[in-house]
Amino acid sequence: PGPPPGPPRVSPDPRAELDSTVLLTRSLLADTRQLAAQLRDKFPADGDHNLDSLPTLAMSAGALGALQLPGVLTRLRADLLSYLRHVQWLRRAGGSSLKTLEPELGTLQARLDRLLRRLQLLMSRLALPQPPPDPPAPPLAPPSSAWGGIRAALAILGGLHLTLDWAVRGLLLLKTRL
């Protein structure tokens, strides 16, 4: 006979898992807000800044009531993967102007990566269907100028802030349904 079975694995409380995800998301939200403020101080720029390659905002605040957990986590993970790719691109191709935002951009990238791993873990703990592997994304073209890099950075941080704000609200609402 084989070795005696070990003690049964205690499945972590999904609400506690969701709590730690909310904390990570909120921390990243504050980081993003502060970094965007720093960037605007260093490079004042009027108006809204857009980047076509960024994901569209997942959900309006008014539509939060209709959320379902699998859909939220899958969409959030996809959007955050896109933002991670954009932050990596920014650090690589953003130009010398954005070097003044190191190490903050590096910290942001590391925390974004940590949040993505946390979401992946949460999805497996909740036995949600795992999303298919991400198709290779087309490479992002380098900014046309230093000013283009700054505008791209403002767009990325602005979009990430909105996405994370939506995520915190959504995750807290979903927690009440678990």
Partner: antibody, heavy 120, light 108 residues
């Protein structure tokens, strides 16, 4: 030594205006975000407004939005709060405060406060 | 808006005793954004603890902070006469930045 000194408080009628100033010394003023926090007589603390070092990001409490304007002059090491359309409930001691660091919103240093009284 | 609720509203203790003040937060917040202040009558507040558990410069070691998520605590291990004051917790993770309503620590 970090010093923050507020001035400009006083008695004003409802609907009136007042401009508070905060003179900063002992640190590189242009490197830190600054806040205004107020305290009504016998009450708790209420955050009012925040401005980043370069003035390009500003936040206000909902209670003062559209009536108060925070600004700064880094060349003069000064922070300002322009208060318009004043109401009785704006009566308070107003403190200027410096953030702890650029990545933490704790209020590390405070002025002694200036009293604003809104009354007819 | 994130709401901070402090308890008790008033705490009556004697010098030498241990004081435990609580701050309950309406939403989960990362601990690095929870701060504690002390205010004495007629004076400006002063930062005691930042990031839930870090002692601010010049603050005696009898003060300590702990907690995470929604529940945070300020502890004064052995009360000195000068510790009797009002204590506020504050969050800086979300705008508007908000304070608790305060706990008054008074001499018994």
């Amino acid at each position: 030594e970090v010093q923050l000194v507020e001035s400009g408080g006083g008695l004003v009628q409802p609907g009136g205006s007042l401009r508070l100033s905060c003179a900063a010394s002992g640190f590189t003023f242009s490197s830190f975000g600054m806040h205004w926090v107020r305290q009504a007589p016998g009450k708790g603390l209420e955050w009012v407004a925040y401005i980043t070092p370069g003035s390009n990001t500003i936040y206000y409490a909902d209670t003062v939005k559209g009536r108060f304007t925070i600004s700064r002059d880094n060349a003069k090491n000064s922070l300002y709060l322009q208060m318009n359309s004043l109401r009785a409930e704006d009566t308070a001691v107003y403190y200027c405060a410096r953030e702890y660091s650029s990545y933490d919103e704790g209020f590390a240093y405070w002025g002694q406060g200036t009293l604003v009284t809104v009354s007819s | 808006e994130i709401v901070l609720t402090q308890s008790p509203a008033t705490l009556s203790l004697s010098p030498g005793e241990r004081a435990t003040l609580s701050c309950s937060v309406s939403d989960l917040i990362p601990s690095q954004y929870l701060h504690w202040y002390q205010q004495k009558p007629g004076q400006a507040p002063r930062l005691l603890i930042y990031g839930a558990s870090n002692l601010a410069s010049g603050i005696p070691a009898r003060f300590s902070g702990s907690g995470s998520g929604t529940d945070f605590t300020l502890t004064i291990s052995s009360l000195e006469p000068e510790d009797f004051a009002v204590y506020y917790c504050q969050q800086g993770v979300d705008v508007p930045f908000t304070f608790g309503q305060g706990t008054k620590l008074e001499i018994k």
